[in-house]
């Protein structure tokens, strides 16, 4: 007798997984853009805001061509994990002014968490190395004032927007190599 029938398809092929990861990243990018605009409407930004604890932007668009799949996914996962922790911190310690960004900030956190799980699943399916995330940074100190919390929110949402924009481009390029 021949081999027993194999299992039916239980989950998406990694290429389909990459497609849905791109869709999820695009959706998160739109959410972030909308939330950043909402923040600017309520609390106009006076210039650029930076937060030393945020990751530096992974890559310029021009350097995308040289990317390798493991490097992109590893770096993206590390950066998004950092942004997730910053969003959690913002919701916890951002002060009453930022309560006006709920429930959108909560939705953003949940979607960011989902994207991270999707990236990890993709890395597992491809059997790409999943190096340990950087050792946890010391806990973020609460903002010194209400305005400090708002400035931090501008920096976090702005940085996340740039990172997700880079991520969409990078993932689309990687799709052609898979």
């Amino acid at each position: 007798p021949g081999p027993p029938p194999g299992p039916p398809r239980v989950s998406p092929d990694p290429r389909a997984e990459l497609d849905s990861t791109v869709l999820l990243t695009r959706s998160l990018l739109a959410d972030t853009r909308q939330l950043a605009a909402q923040l600017r409407d309520k609390f106009p930004a006076d210039g650029d805001h930076n937060l030393d604890s945020l990751p530096t932007l992974a890559m310029s668009a021009g350097a995308l061509g040289a990317l390798q799949l493991p490097g992109v996914l590893t770096r993206l996962r590390a950066d998004l994990l950092s942004y997730l922790r910053h969003v959690q911190w913002l919701r916890r310690a951002g002060g009453s002014s930022l309560k006006t960004l709920e429930p959108e900030l909560g939705t953003l956190q949940a979607r960011l968490d989902r994207l991270l799980r999707r990236l990890q699943l993709l890395m597992s399916r491809l059997a790409l190395p999943q190096p340990p995330p950087d050792p946890p940074a010391p806990p973020l100190a609460p903002p010194s004032s209400a305005w400090g919390g708002i400035r931090a929110a501008h920096a976090i949402l702005g940085g996340l927007h740039l990172t997700l924009d880079w991520a969409v481009r990078g993932l689309l390029l990687l799709k052609t190599r898979l």
């Epitope: 194999g6 699943l121 491809l126 190395p129």
Partner: antibody, heavy 114, light 111 residues
Framework: EVQLLESGGGLVQPGGSLRLSCAAS????????MHWVRQAPGKGLEWVAV????????YYADSVKGRFTISRDNSKNTLYLQMNSLRAEDTAVYYC???????WGQGTLVTVSS | QSVLTQPPSASGTPGQRVTISCSGS?????????VHWYQQLPGTAPKLLIY???ERPSGVPDRFSGSKSGTSASLAISGLRSEDEADYYC???????????FGGGTKLTVL
């Protein structure tokens, strides 16, 4: 439907060698990382080795490092496990598995005994 | 000895709810890494039951659910049936080993 069919198992003496093969069909083999996982009689599952979708990354359990080699041929949709310096404790059913692993073969029995 | 710790056995009567735990460390479950669960019926190959902590593959009944918190995870089976009698294994990627690790397995008996 997805099929993973292992072959190459059998009885071998301690210190001997065997090469296991796993023929894959029903899915895009070249898009999946592939694993070998074994199960000694009456025992639990033990991961043996993994190879990335394109063959560029290979990792091994400490218990087989330096003795076993995992490889793949994406043009033939086939996964391999070259097992050298076999020991009695390598006796197990060897499963080939794809992805997380999402899919598993039915396994092939390797018996190491004199 | 397995890297992930599971109780060797669990039991329940038909219709009952049973939970199987899986405990890891900071290099696997606690390292923001996902947990997967497998069911192995007697004499057969393992089958993916839950992936990414709580996702069910198509074809797996919603009586099976998974969750994760900190360095541990659990599999819950509600409305227990006689056909659920099997060995259940948890698995997760381990940062320090650069590969997946399995729990020792839990033999579920339906009384």
């Amino acid at each position: 439907e997805v099929q993973l069919l292992e072959s190459g198992g059998g009885l071998v003496q301690p210190g001997g060698s065997l090469r296991l093969s796993c023929a894959a069909s029903g899915f895009t083999f070249s898009s999946y990382g592939m694993h070998w996982v074994r199960q000694a009689p009456g025992k639990g599952l033990e991961w043996v080795a993994v190879i990335s979708y394109d063959g560029s990354y290979k990792y091994y359990a400490d218990s087989v490092k330096g003795r076993f080699t995992i490889s793949r041929d994406n043009s033939k949709n086939t996964l391999y496990l070259q097992m050298n310096s076999l020991r009695a404790e390598d006796t197990a059913v060897y499963y080939c598995a794809a992805g997380v692993p999402d899919y598993w073969g039915q396994g092939t029995l390797v018996t190491v005994s004199s | 000895q397995s890297v992930l710790t599971q109780p060797p056995s669990a039991s329940g009567t038909p219709g009952q709810r049973v939970t199987i735990s899986c405990s890891g460390s900071s290099s696997n479950i606690g390292s923001d890494l996902d947990v997967h669960w497998y069911q192995q019926l007697p004499g057969t190959a393992p089958k993916l039951l839950i992936y990414s902590n709580e996702e069910r593959p198509s074809g797996v009944p919603d009586r099976f659910s998974g969750s994760k918190s900190g360095t541990s995870a659990s599999l819950a089976i509600s409305g227990l049936r006689s056909e659920d009698e099997a060995d259940y294994y948890c698995a997760a990627w381990d940062d320090s080993l650069y590969g997946p690790v399995f729990g020792g397995g839990t033999k579920l008996t339906v009384l």
